[in-house]
Interface confidence: medium
């Protein structure tokens, strides 16, 4: 079943390449298990670049080695994705699922478009 | 008369707070006298950034305290604006007008979308 | 036809004030800069005074900053120059000229005579 | 600010005669330089923009060159109507111009 989800159209990463977004969903039930996805495409290439599973009021639990992490409140989830390079400049797209209980339900943002600016370097410090 | 301008969407400053982009006009006539001039649009707030004059053929001559320089060449206005910080981020309007010889003629682009980031200092050298 | 028509000129005393105008018609007004050229008798060009097409940049020579003030209308295709502590040294034909970077179109000029 | 010296002051020549004033700018102004003439108690009129552009309605006898700081007005043939004071003028500070000192072409 279908779900509205929605995100900033476009979203400026800083000079350290970290970049946040608020992902909102309007959840149609009470969901206890949520799954949060994040999609980036670029060159009608559609890769994953994190994903994570919470319980309704807890964090957001990414793996150890994922680029993103995230909180949680009510129906938004708050997304930072972090080591961003001007190379990853593209469109993050949230996908939310209501994994738990039925009925199953999906909804896909439109993509926050994140805008990645490598600073320049630091003089030698002699 | 009116005049069609194209402009790219969206542009990011570099690092050094330096953006850059095309204004293309299609040229009714046989202008010798072109002027373009740059707005900045940010909260329904229209201000002028600068503005400059050129022969067709020359260079774009802004005034000495502009934060504007350009180039020209034929139909084509490469603008770069410096100084910028996160501060200026909003969408920046090309307006050319064919000044010289009559009829005169009129266009305005849909805008660039400037975004700066603020770079974070380096740490002090000991 | 373009044509530059200026007027407010005449006979003022040092330290006393003049209103020039300048009345535009045959071109789109309110689309190009405009200023303010002065010739002394028997002498060369001068450039005084210029105004964007907004009006609200202006441009004065070093001589006259503070004392004379550019202002346009573009509703009734105007341009004007208050004039205030006026000098003997501003005794000139002063014309209203504009039209692009360079100054395409000229009045006839107004001659405003500063003496007591 | 940018200085404008037209030499020579005067000059007088025949009917017929090619003639030729210069300008010099105190600093590179592209091509950002005009000519007009004007007659006595007359308003300056423009004749050649943007260093060799000919005004509309200007006899193409008029001719203007240079770039940078180095610039020239040349009348290939005098005609009476011809004879006036000569000024030039930089348009690189726009709209803040600058006028050189005349060049009176006078009747030999």
């Known amino acids: 079943k279908a779900m509205h989800v929605a995100q900033p159209a476009v979203v400026l990463a800083n000079s350290r390449g970290i970049a946040s977004f608020v992902c909102e969903y309007a959840s149609p039930g009470k969901a206890t298990e949520v799954r949060v996805t994040v999609l980036r495409q670029a060159d009608s290439q559609v890769t994953e670049v994190c994903a994570a599973t919470y319980m309704m009021g807890n964090e957001l639990t990414f793996l150890d080695d994922s680029i993103c992490t995230g909180t949680s409140s009510g129906n938004q989830v708050n997304l930072t994705i972090q080591g961003l390079r001007a190379m990853d400049t593209g469109l993050y797209i949230c996908k939310v699922e209501l994994m738990y209980p039925p009925p199953y339900y999906m909804g896909i943002g439109n993509g926050t478009q994140i805008y990645v600016i490598d600073p320049e370097p630091c003089p030698d410090s002699d | 008369k009116a005049m069609h301008v194209a402009q790219p969407a969206v542009v990011l400053a570099n690092s050094r707070g330096i953006a850059s982009f095309v204004c293309e006009y299609a040229s009714p006539g046989k202008a010798t006298e072109v002027r373009v001039t740059v707005l900045r649009q940010a909260d329904s707030q229209v201000t002028e950034v600068c503005a400059a004059t050129y022969m067709m053929g020359n260079e774009l001559t802004f005034l000495d305290d502009s934060i504007c320089t350009g180039t020209s060449s034929g139909n084509q206005v490469n603008l770069t604006i410096q100084g910028l910080r996160a501060m200026d981020t909003g969408l920046y309007i090309c307006k050319v007008e064919l000044m010289y010889p009559p009829p005169y003629y009129m266009g305005i682009g849909n805008g660039t979308q400037i975004y700066v980031i603020d770079p974070e200092p380096c740490p002090d050298s000991d | 036809e373009v044509q530059l028509v200026e007027s407010g000129g005449g006979l003022v005393q040092p330290g006393g004030s003049l209103r020039l105008s300048c009345a535009a018609s045959?071109?789109?007004?309110?689309?190009?800069?405009m200023s303010w050229v002065r010739q002394a008798p028997g002498k060369g060009l001068e450039w005084v005074s210029s105004?964007?097409?907004?009006?609200?940049?202006?441009y004065y020579a070093d001589s006259m900053k503070g004392r004379f003030t550019i202002s346009r209308d573009n509703a009734k295709n105007s341009l004007y120059l208050q004039m205030n502590s006026l000098r003997a040294e501003d005794t000139a034909v002063y014309y209203c000229?504009?039209?692009?970077?360079?100054?395409?179109?000229w009045g006839q000029g107004t001659l405003v005579t500063v003496s007591s | 600010d940018i200085q404008m010296t037209q030499s020579p002051s005067s000059v007088s020549a025949s009917v017929g005669d090619r003639v030729t004033i210069t300008c010099r700018a105190s600093?590179?102004?592209?091509?950002?330089l005009a000519w007009y003439q004007q007659k006595p108690g007359k308003a300056p009129k423009l004749l050649i923009y943007?260093?060799?552009s000919l005004q509309t309605g200007v006899p193409s006898r008029f001719s203007g060159s240079g770039y940078g700081t180095d610039f020239t007005l040349t009348i290939s043939s005098l005609q009476p109507e011809d004879f006036a004071t000569y000024y030039c003028?930089?348009?690189?500070?726009?709209?803040?111009?600058?006028f050189g000192q005349g060049t009176k072409l006078e009747i030999k």
């Open positions: 000229a504009g039209g692009g970077t360079f100054l395409h179109y």
């Open positions: 045959g071109f789109t007004f309110s689309n190009y800069e």
């Open positions: 105004i964007r097409t907004s009006g609200t940049t202006k």
């Open positions: 600093q590179g102004i592209a091509s950002y």
């Open positions: 943007a260093a060799s």
């Open positions: 003028q930089q348009a690189k500070s726009f709209p803040m111009y600058t």
